[in-house]
Each structure stands twice: as structure tokens, then as C-alpha cells.
């Protein structure tokens, strides 16, 4: 499956939007840093099938969408930027969904890579728990924004590796 050229452009736009969502200087938030235990092994260059990688990427973007579409994120972040961000993520999801169907067929894909998908879901659960414990403070959002930018960058790198293997 060939992801369209607009897909990588969308990735870059999403990262730019995340960068623009900054509300306070991160320099005041050092002590709020937290280990979310990013599931690095799901993004490493292990010998998994392309379909598995696409499923993991899809879950990553879906969970990012869910995280940023809560009422708490709407209250904490710029709504115009959020709306643009949703559009980019939605396009990414559509691209990946059509790819999943081409690679393995719609029926088997969600179950085949359950462990990988579960690892991504648990990662986002830890992020949500952190935000709750920090009462959705400005610094907590700043830490989460930095974390999502990092995980998004790693997702982009995985997509690049997939493309280069074609």
C-alpha cells in the first residue's frame, strides 16, 4: 500500500500544530516531567509485517485524536488549532484505514496485532492518568504536548522506514 504524498505533509502539519499549541514556557515545568513508558519496542525496526506497523500507527493516531478531543483539552488548548489538528489526524486515519484494508483485509487486522495495539492503549492510559492526577494543569499539558510531539515524531520515522522498504 502506498500512502499518498499528502500523508507525510499532513504529518508535518500535525507536528507544527502541536508546536503552536504551547500555552506557557516549558522552562517552568521541569519538575513535572514524567516517564510515560513509551512502547518503543512497537516502533523499533523489528521484523514485523507492514500490516502490523500500519495497525500500530493507526492506533497511535486514534488515541492521539481521543486524547485531544476531550472537554479538558478543549478548555486548556487553543480551539482553532485543535480543530485544524483534528482535521489532520482524521485524514491520517483515513489514509491508514484504506492501507490496512489493502494489506490484510478488514476482518483479521484488529485481532492479529492485539498485543501491539494494547501496548499503545496502555501508554495513552498512563498519559490520561497523569493529566488527571495533575488536575489538567498548564504544566501537565505542556509535558503531555512534548511527549506527544516525541511519539508523533517516532511514528513519522516508522512511516518513513516502511516507505523506504517498499
Amino acid at each position: 500500500c502506498d500512502l499518498p504524498q499528502t500523508h507525510s505533509l499532513g504529518n508535518r502539519r500535525a507536528l507544527i500544530l502541536l508546536a503552536q499549541m504551547r500555552r506557557i514556557s516549558p522552562f517552568s515545568c521541569l519538575k513535572d516531567r514524567h516517564d510515560f513508558e513509551f512502547p518503543q519496542e512497537e516502533f523499533d525496526d523489528k521484523q514485523f509485517q507492514k500490516a502490523q506497523a500500519i495497525s500500530v500507527l493507526h492506533e497511535m493516531i486514534q488515541q492521539t485524536f481521543n486524547l485531544f478531543s476531550t472537554k479538558d483539552s478543549s478548555a486548556a488548548l487553543d480551539e482553532t488549532l485543535l480543530d485544524e489538528f483534528y482535521i489532520e489526524l482524521d485524514q491520517q486515519l483515513n489514509d491508514l484505514e484504506s492501507c490496512v484494508m489493502q494489506e490484510v483485509g478488514v476482518i483479521e487486522s484488529p485481532l492479529m496485532y492485539e498485543d501491539s495495539i494494547l501496548a499503545v492503549r496502555k501508554y495513552f492510559q498512563r498519559i490520561t492518568l497523569y493529566l488527571t492526577e495533575k488536575k489538567y494543569s498548564s504544566c501537565a499539558w505542556e509535558v503531555v504536548r512534548a511527549e506527544i510531539m516525541r511519539s508523533f515524531s517516532l511514528s513519522i520515522n516508522l512511516q518513513k522506514r516502511l516507505k523506504s522498504k517498499e
Epitope: A19, R22, S25, P26, F27, S28, C29, L30, K31, D32, R33, H34, D35, F36, E142, V143, A146, E147, M149, R150, S153
Partner: antibody, heavy 121, light 107 residues
Framework: EVQLVQSGAEVKKPGESLKISCKGS????????IGWVRQMPGKGLEWMGI????????AYSPSFQGQVTISADKSISTAYLQWSSLKASDTAMYYC??????????????WGQGTLVTVSS | DIQMTQSPSSLSASVGDRVTITCRAS??????LNWYQQKPGKAPKLLIY???SLQSGVPSRFSGSGSGTDFTLTISSLQPEDFATYYC?????????FGQGTKVEIK
């Protein structure tokens, strides 16, 4: 390979200006902050300040606020430390080091080789 | 500002010795503490981050512990290449601050 390469040693007179540089390579320059650390002859390490190259936001140690300026040019992956009027007490080795920002990763994991600044009349 | 106090300021030890350096913060810094090694004429090198995490490539004879205000760097069996100056640094809040250093010399 991650590298921070600093500009060469400088010998200056009191009152002169100076700008030293730190060029990052082998990683995404805008994904890490760049900090500056001073070490006067025979002394310990002193943190001077830091910059986020993605938007040039800076933070300074109160001891260095107003004494130096930290800047960056992300298009060439380079951070700078500058003085408008040097003093003899600015004689020191200056190091740059990268910092992961708010990400859970090692602080100051890579350092430049240092730039020796000598200020003497 | 958070003050960092290291002790001792210098120590003499022999190859094979177990060496312990302590660092105390003037207020709680949770586990936001780093340890660096510096040899003459060289840039500092990160050994331990977040109080107890061993930096990649650093020998396992180095270990860190502590949280809150009291921290320890331990070298389980001192090697010839370990003779250097060691600095702690709080990573809790700006301005970042270093301890004054501990020089480990050959006995």
C-alpha cells in the same frame, strides 16, 4: 552520530564583544534544548542559561542574566553565546550541552568540546 | 535557587576500593538529580540521570540512589580511569545548579 561542535578558542581584550557557537548534528536540533555551562580556571561547573531552538525561548541563571545573550539559528542547527562587553572575569571554558526539554530522557547527555575564552589587556 | 552541597570535596582511594560521594539539595528535588564525571581538559560526561538511571555506555560499577534531598553516587570497585572530578546537578527547576565537585585522587 550525535555531535556538538563548538567554535575555537578566543583571545579578547576587556570591553570587546564576542559570539561563540555550538553546532549540533546527528539529531533533530529543534527537538532538544541547548544549555550553556561556564567553568572558570580550576573551578566547578556553573549553569548559565538555556535555549529552545524551535522558538528561541530562553531562560537564564540570575547570575548571568543581562551579562550574556543566548540565541540560535535553527536553519543551520547552531546555538550561540554572546557578550557585548567582555571583562577579565569572563575568562573561562564555555561548554554547550543538549537537554531533552520536558521529555523523560537523559539531561545534558552530549556536550561540546568547550570553547576557551581568554580576556586580557 | 536550589543549593547543591557535595561531600567530601576530595578523597583519596585505591584501585578496587568502593567509593561513595554524597550530594544534598537545599530543598526537595524528588529524583531530579544527575551525576557527571569530568577529567582534566575534557568536557563533563553524564553518568547517572534521574538519581538512579545509568546512562548508556557507562560501566555498571557506577550507581546512583536517593530522592528528596539526599543522594549518593557509588563506584563499587574503583578503576584507574575513574580518577576524576564528579559533580551532581539538580534537574528539578531553573536555575539548574551543580554541586561544587568531588575530586577522586589516587592514594
Amino acid at each position: 552520530e550525535v555531535q556538538l561542535v563548538q567554535s575555537g578558542a578566543e583571545v579578547k581584550k576587556p570591553g570587546e564583544s564576542l559570539k561563540i557557537s555550538c553546532k549540533g548534528s546527528g539529531y533533530s536540533f529543534t527537538s532538544y534544548w541547548i544549555g550553556w555551562v561556564r567553568q572558570m580556571p580550576g573551578k566547578g561547573l556553573e549553569w548559565m542559561g538555556i535555549i529552545d531552538p524551535s522558538d528561541s525561548d530562553t531562560a537564564y541563571s540570575p547570575s548571568f542574566q543581562g551579562q550574556v545573550t543566548i540565541s540560535a539559528d535553527k536553519s543551520i542547527s547552531t546555538a550561540y553565546l554572546q557578550w557585548s562587553s567582555l571583562k577579565a572575569s569572563d575568562t573561562a571554558m564555555y561548554y554547550c550541552a543538549r537537554h531533552p526539554g520536558l521529555n523523560w530522557a537523559p539531561d545534558f547527555d552530549y556536550w561540546g568540546q568547550g570553547t576557551l575564552v581568554t580576556v586580557s589587556s | 535557587d536550589i543549593q547543591m552541597t557535595q561531600s567530601p570535596s576530595s578523597l583519596s582511594a585505591s584501585v578496587g576500593d568502593r567509593v561513595t560521594i554524597t550530594c544534598r539539595a537545599s530543598q526537595s528535588i524528588d529524583e531530579f538529580l544527575n551525576w557527571y564525571q569530568q577529567k582534566p581538559g575534557k568536557a563533563p560526561k553524564l553518568l547517572i540521570y534521574f538519581a538512579s538511571s545509568l546512562q548508556s555506555g557507562v560501566p555498571s560499577r557506577f550507581s546512583g540512589s536517593g530522592s528528596g534531598t539526599d543522594f549518593t553516587l557509588t563506584i563499587s570497585s574503583l578503576q584507574p580511569e575513574d580518577f576524576a572530578t564528579y559533580y551532581c546537578q539538580q534537574a528539578h527547576s531553573f536555575p539548574l545548579t551543580f554541586g561544587q565537585g568531588t575530586k577522586v585522587e589516587i592514594k
